[in-house]
Amino acid sequence: AITEAREEAKPYPLFPGPLPGSLQTDHTSLLSLPHTSGYQPALMFSPTQPGRPYTGNVAIPRVTSAGSKLLPPLAFKHTVGHIILSEHKDVKFNCSISVPNIYQDTTISWWKDGKELLGAHHAITQFYPDDEVTAIIASFSITSVQRSDNGSYICKMKINNEEIVSDPIYIEVQGLPHFTKQPESMNVTRNTAFNLTCQAVGPPEPVNIFWVQNSSRVNEQPEKSPSVLTVPGLTEMAVFSCEAHNDKGLTVSKGVQINIKAIPSPPTEVSIHNSTAHSILISWVPGFDGYSPFRNCSVQVKEVDPLSNGSVMIFNTSASPHMYQIKQLQALANYSIGVSCMNEIGWSAVSPWILASTTEGAPSVAPLNVTVFLNESRDNVDIRWMKPLTKRQAGELVGYRISHVWQSAGISKELLEEVGQNNSRAQISVQVHNATCTVRIAAVTKGGVGPFSDPVKIFIPAHGWVDHAPSSTPAPGNADPVLII
């Protein structure tokens, strides 16, 4: 059952003097009626209590058909004006009105703060008919009130397109202070001032604030809500909270951690994803950011071959993604790689260094002294060359690639041959007579194909010619040789 939950009731002031006869009678007789719900309506006036009708919004009935007697204006009877109660208590309040029986289809609706209360609200309307009038009691109950139930409640009744409105009933739900703004976790610079804000509301007001740092009160005297705490600076992490006090008791905010920004921890797990002759793709796992977002990272690359200079290359990159392709590296070299990242405070230490190697590169020079001549049988072209002076970074020579292009009137075709690294000569079959054969040779390592030599051209005559003089790589700056045989 809903119990009476009135901690304090304040009726609106009532004017002395009797009510107009019929309403006064109705009022008196109403109290003696049984209540179908079984509950005594909250704060009903006793028969001896003086009262007045609400005159702000009344329905004036017309002359009745039975005679010329005017009916009194209709108005809701006065009830309690202000109910104060604690959170989670139950409350019931009502409106009552006596309506002459000449009116049909009267309905009462409840409104809160100007909005009609529809749906699943505990509103009950009871009708008590008599000879001339019907007493109507509209009850509204709230179980376990919350702050959101605070507000001004009124009843409305529509009769003959007229609207009758009751006096408002103010519901004030009081409880422990309720935070509307709590301090927020922050990351702050060491020894730099910052502010924390705390705001709490009642009712009841006032609400007073105490600040707590690491379980100790900061202010001796409370501050009225809202309160801003200026912390002059911290050297180490601290936890702050605020206490909000009112007459109902105390509420403590969440504790918030104030972190001191620091340089980041070094990245970890630097990994090699891919190596080529001149680049290495790495990734890393960022360290702890020191309570300040990463700004960028630095990839440090150090030559570590025993005979290397030890040159250090530093590549700056964005903090995300945690990957970087290191370029401009030497082929077939060993490197030590570390990563460091920075935030607004500074650079982290370098990650643990990892060793990485580049692969063999392609040769950077072409074979030397390429010569081409037609052999005695005239069925083959002999090609000779000298091994190039490849740099060690190119790795081991695995062979040579020979390109020979055959051109005659309307025909041009390129063929490629591969020969082993121990060769310094090759024979190719004549593809077309009365044509020019252009030969180029490139050295090949595991790292790839090097540059081709300058082209050497030889003319392959029609059958019956005799000359076998060779063509050879030109001296630098000369035009491509063409030997007509």
Partner: antibody
Framework: QVQLQQPGAELVKPGASVKVSCKAS????????MHWVKQRPGQGLEWIGR????????NYNQKFKGKATLTVDKSSSTAYMQLSSLTSEDSAVYYC???????WGQGTLVTVSA | DIVMTQSPATLSVTPGDRVSLSCRAS??????LNWYQQKSHESPRLLIK???QSISGIPSRFSGSGSGSDFTLSINSVEPEDVGVYYC?????????FGAGTKLELK
């Protein structure tokens, strides 16, 4: 131009320690490995170890571990080699060298004598 | 450790001679080999790196060759100032090791 300056000589007593310095100039100190090499009178060359001033990374010849300790002072662009528990066997010229042995100091003659 | 063996221990030459100094590694070191010249009372001087790469400022009469474990330093036409001790050095793996040296002297 690149210069590696070493004191000409150090005279120390047996059992004592000595810290040989090598002051670098004419290049970025933190860019190259610094090697240390020992040469006993009339003998060949022995590699002691190397240190990288960028991060104090070191590699030692196992033979000299416990005998030599390599350090750097970036603020003065100086590399140091400390030799401990000295005996007559440690009497030698000690060279510092950088850039894949392209540049050498003049050497410091350490004489261990009572 | 890799042992570097140099031969001959001493080489007597006449100015203008072409000479070859040999260096053999106890294991394959690819071309990770340096050659140094050390004159009396001086610091060593790098002549050739990575077996055959010339060094800026070194006279062109000095050249290096070889790969794997056998290496040669050649002096095309010996000059009197070339007198000194020549060392080869393993640069393949730690510890870095030097040969005992070849002493070049004038006849």
């Amino acid at each position: 131009q690149v210069q590696l300056q070493q004191p000409g000589a150090e005279l120390v007593k047996p059992g004592a320690s000595v810290k040989v310095s090598c002051k670098a100039s004419g290049y970025t100190f933190t860019s190259y490995w610094m090697h240390w090499v020992k040469q006993r009178p009339g003998q060949g060359l022995e590699w002691i170890g190397r240190i990288h001033p960028f991060d104090s990374d070191t590699n030692y010849n196992q033979k000299f571990k416990g005998k030599a300790t390599l350090t750097v002072d970036k603020s003065s662009s100086t590399a140091y080699m400390q030799l401990s528990s000295l005996t007559s066997e440690d009497s030698a010229v000690y060279y510092c060298s950088i850039a894949g042995f392209a540049y050498w100091g003049q050497g410091t003659l350490v004489t261990v004598s009572a | 450790d890799i042992v570097m063996t140099q031969s001959p221990a001493t080489l007597s030459v006449t100015p203008g001679d072409r000479v070859s100094l040999s260096c053999r590694a106890s294991q394959i070191i690819s071309d990770y080999l340096n050659w140094y010249q050390q004159k009396s009372h001086e610091s060593p001087r790098l002549l050739i790196k990575y077996a055959s790469q010339s060094i800026s400022g070194i006279p062109s009469r000095f050249s290096g060759s070889g790969s794997g474990s056998d290496f040669t330093l050649s002096i095309n036409s010996v000059e009197p100032e070339d007198v000194g001790v020549y060392y080869c050095q393993n640069g393949h793996s730690f510890p870095l090791t030097f040969g005992a040296g070849t002493k070049l002297e004038l006849k």
